[in-house]
């Protein structure tokens, strides 16, 4: 079974501003899972609706 995501490498510790980096296996690229209260591709924006 191939997992859908992996931990990002150490090189990507600063990839996400307010979130956790996950490496999307099938898309072969990093992505960010934002902490509560943040949005954006890199979790760079405060969620004004939160």
């Amino acid at each position: 079974v191939v997992s859908h995501f992996n931990d990002c490498p150490d090189s990507h510790t600063q990839f996400c501003f307010h979130g956790t980096c996950r490496f999307l296996v099938q898309e072969d690229k990093p992505a960010c899972v934002c902490h509560s209260g943040y949005v954006g591709a890199r979790c760079e924006h405060a969620d004004l609706l939160a």
């Epitope: 090189s11 990507h12 296996v25 099938q26 072969d28 690229k29 990093p30």
Partner: antibody
Framework: VQLQQSGAELVRPGASVKLSCTAS????????MHWMKQRPEQGLEWIGR????????KYAPKFQDKATITADTSSNTAYLQLSSLTSEDTAVYYC?????????WGQGTTLTVSS | IQMTQSSSSLSVSLGDRVTITCKAS??????LAWYQQKPGNAPRLLIS???NLKTGVPSRFSGSASGKDYTLSITSLQTEDVATYYC?????????FGGGTKLEIK
């Protein structure tokens, strides 16, 4: 899906040069873009990388004062500028982006520094 | 992170099974690539993620991982496989490369 680099350069010592690397088939904003150096008959060295989404850069210490990496997301292109050129900068320069399943390298740009 | 290829050159015969090894100084969690380079040419990416064969690379090439040890295998060496092979870690920056293993025909 590929990385296409600019053509060979012959430049004078002391000058600067700007090399380009244009991506097709993927968005350079999705991940970091890296640059490598390979001198004749030698191994590969990492110069540095850029996060094209925000311009954040990181360099190997030995290239800190030599290289400047930039990116233009509108043209999906990363650049490597090398300054104060000497014969030590004569090399082939490669751009790259690496994933777990796939990886992409440009074909290389040969830089010759000679008077 | 240091990447050590224990053999700088290997003397091989056509048809041989060839194994090239690479050891990382720390755990790199399979963020490893293998390249083939022939004189005057750019490095050719063979494998990424330690085991994932790039499209178009012959199936006689394979990669494996065990802890900090990584292996590139060629099941039956062909003339066109005579080249220098490099490993590379991309777990962290600076990316680092092994010193290369040059295959030479006996």
């Amino acid at each position: 899906v590929q990385l296409q680099q600019s053509g060979a350069e012959l430049v004078r010592p002391g000058a600067s040069v700007k090399l380009s690397c244009t991506a097709s088939g993927f968005n350079i904003k999705d991940d970091y873009m890296h640059w490598m150096k390979q001198r004749p008959e030698q191994g590969l060295e990492w110069i540095g990388r850029i996060d094209p989404a925000n311009g954040n850069t990181k360099y190997a210490p030995k290239f800190q004062d030599k290289a400047t990496i930039t990116a233009d997301t509108s043209s999906n292109t990363a650049y490597l500028q090398l300054s104060s050129l000497t014969s030590e900068d004569t090399a082939v320069y490669y751009c790259s982006r690496m994933g777990l399943l796939r990886g992409y390298w440009g074909q290389g740009t040969t830089l010759t520094v000679s008077s | 992170i240091q990447m050590t290829q224990s053999s700088s050159s290997l003397s091989v015969s056509l048809g041989d099974r060839v194994t090239i090894t690479c050891k990382a100084s720390v755990h790199i969690n399979s963020w490893l690539a293998w390249y083939q380079q022939k004189p005057g040419n750019a490095p050719r990416l063979l494998i990424s993620g330690a085991t994932n064969l790039k499209t178009g690379v012959p199936s006689r090439f394979s990669g494996s991982a065990s802890g900090k040890d990584y292996t590139l295998s060629i099941t039956s060496l062909q003339t066109e496989d005579v080249a220098t092979y490099y490993c590379q870690q991309y777990w962290d920056t600076p990316w680092t490369f092994g010193g290369g293993t040059k295959l030479e025909i006996k």
